[in-house]
C-alpha cells in the first residue's frame, strides 16, 4: 500500500512526587517502520529511561504504536518526541499549561 | 541497495583537523540516522556520535568537544570533523545506518571505513 | 559509560563444531544488545539485534541469548565463512558501547 503518514499525539499524565509521565502515540500510520523517540534539550534520551509499545494494527490497514518516559513537572518544555516515518520526520513538543494533549498529522 | 561510502585522507599531522565524507545511496538522509564508529589498530569498535534524520546530532560525551557531525541531505552524504587529532586518534573510521524501532536500535548497514592515520 | 566485557579474546574451533560466544556488561541492559561480525578485511556485518532477533540473510545457525547483564552468541555449525571477530554492542545508556570483541579461528 502506499504510505500513510502518523498522527502524533503527545499527552501528560499527573503522578506522585512531583514526577509526571510524558506518552508520544503515532497513529494511522503505514507502513509499520517507524521511529519514535524522546529528547531532551535535543539530546536523545537513553533506551534505560523510555518505555515502548509494540507497534500493533489498529484494524484500518494502518499502524499505532508509543513512548513514554518519565519527567519532573516543570520540565516539560526541555522534551520533545521525535518521529521518523518513511522519509519524513517531526518534532513535537509536550503541551504546556492546562493544555494536556497536542496532536499533528504529518504531511 | 542500501550502501554507504567513507572517503578520508587518509594521513593527518598532530594537532590538526580531520574530514571524513559517508556518501550513502539506496536510501534518504531524511528519513534514517547515521553513526560514526572507530576502531583503532587491534582494538575494539568505539561509537562516537550520529545525525538522525532531522539533522539533530548525538556525540559521545567523551569526544563531544572534538567532534561535529553535519551532512547534506541532497547530496546524500554525511560529514564528520573530528579537532585536535593525537596519534590515539589513528583508526578505522566506518559510518553505518542506523534502524531506531521502538526497542530495537541497531547499525544495519556499514561502510568498509576508511583509514585514518595521524602523524607527523 | 556501560563497559561491555568479552572474557574470550581468541578461540579456536573445528569446522561443524557449535561455538559460544559470551558477553556481560557492568549494569543490566534489558536485552538492548546487538551482535556483529568483522570480517578479516574489516568489512562489518549486523548479526543479531535485540539480543536474539535475527535480521534477514543471517544464517539459522546464529543465535543469541541472555539477559541482564550476561549475554551469548552462538555457532551451531561453524563455517569457513565465520572465520570473523565478533562484537557484542548495549544500546540500554548512551553513549552505545562495544565488548573488546572475539576472534573466531579455525583449530
Known amino acids: 500500500g502506499s504510505t500513510v503518514p502518523p498522527m502524533v499525539n503527545v499527552t501528560c499524565s499527573e503522578v506522585s512526587e512531583g514526577n509526571i509521565t510524558v506518552t508520544c502515540r503515532a497513529s494511522s500510520f503505514y507502513p509499520r517502520n517507524i521511529t519514535l523517540t524522546w529528547r531532551q534539550d535535543g539530546v536523545s534520551l537513553s533506551h534505560n529511561t523510555q518505555q515502548w509499545g509494540d507497534v500493533l494494527p489498529d484494524g484500518n490497514g494502518t499502524y499505532q504504536t508509543w513512548v513514554a518516559t518519565r519527567i519532573r513537572q516543570g520540565e516539560e518544555q526541555r522534551f520533545t518526541c521525535y518521529m521518523e516515518h518513511s522519509g519524513n520526520h517531526g518534532t513535537h513538543p509536550v503541551p504546556s499549561g492546562n493544555s494536556h494533549h497536542h496532536h499533528h498529522h504529518h504531511h | 541497495q542500501v550502501q554507504l561510502k567513507e572517503s578520508g585522507p587518509g594521513l593527518v599531522a598532530p594537532s590538526q583537523s580531520l574530514s571524513i565524507t559517508c556518501t550513502v545511496s539506496?536510501?534518504?538522509?531524511?528519513?534514517?540516522?547515521v553513526n560514526w564508529v572507530r576502531q583503532p589498530p587491534g582494538q575494539g569498535l568505539e561509537w562516537l556520535g550520529m545525525?538522525?534524520?532531522?539533522?539533530?546530532?548525538d556525540y559521545n560525551s567523551a569526544l563531544k568537544s572534538r567532534l561535529s557531525i553535519s551532512k547534506d541531505n541532497s547530496k546524500s552524504q554525511v560529514f564528520l570533523k573530528m579537532n585536535s587529532l593525537q596519534t590515539d586518534d589513528t583508526a578505522r573510521y566506518y559510518c553505518?545506518?542506523?534502524?531506531?524501532?521502538?526497542?530495537?536500535?541497531?547499525?544495519?548497514?556499514w561502510g568498509a571505513g576508511t583509514t585514518v592515520t595521524v602523524s607527523s | 559509560d556501560i563497559q561491555m566485557t568479552q572474557t574470550t579474546f581468541s578461540l579456536s574451533a573445528s569446522l561443524g563444531d557449535r561455538v559460544t560466544i559470551s558477553c556481560s556488561a557492568s549494569?543490566?541492559?534489558?536485552?538492548?544488545l546487538n551482535w556483529y561480525q568483522q570480517r578479516p578485511d574489516g568489512t562489518v556485518k549486523l548479526l543479531i539485534y535485540?539480543?536474539?532477533t535475527l535480521p534477514s540473510g543471517v544464517p539459522s545457525r546464529f543465535s543469541g541469548s541472555g539477559s541482564g547483564t550476561d549475554y551469548s552468541l552462538t555457532i551451531s555449525n561453524l563455517e569457513p565463512e565465520d572465520i570473523a571477530s565478533y562484537y557484542c554492542?548495549?544500546?540500554?545508556?548512551?553513549?552505545?558501547?562495544f565488548g573488546g570483541g572475539t576472534k573466531v579461528e579455525i583449530k
Open positions: 553505518a545506518r542506523g534502524a531506531h524501532y521502538g526497542k530495537r536500535w541497531y547499525f544495519d548497514v
Open positions: 539506496g536510501f534518504s538522509l531524511t528519513g534514517s540516522g
Open positions: 545525525i538522525w534524520g532531522d539533522g539533530n546530532t
Open positions: 535485540y539480543t536474539s
Open positions: 549494569q543490566g541492559i534489558n536485552n538492548y
Open positions: 554492542q548495549q544500546y540500554s545508556k548512551l553513549p552505545p558501547t
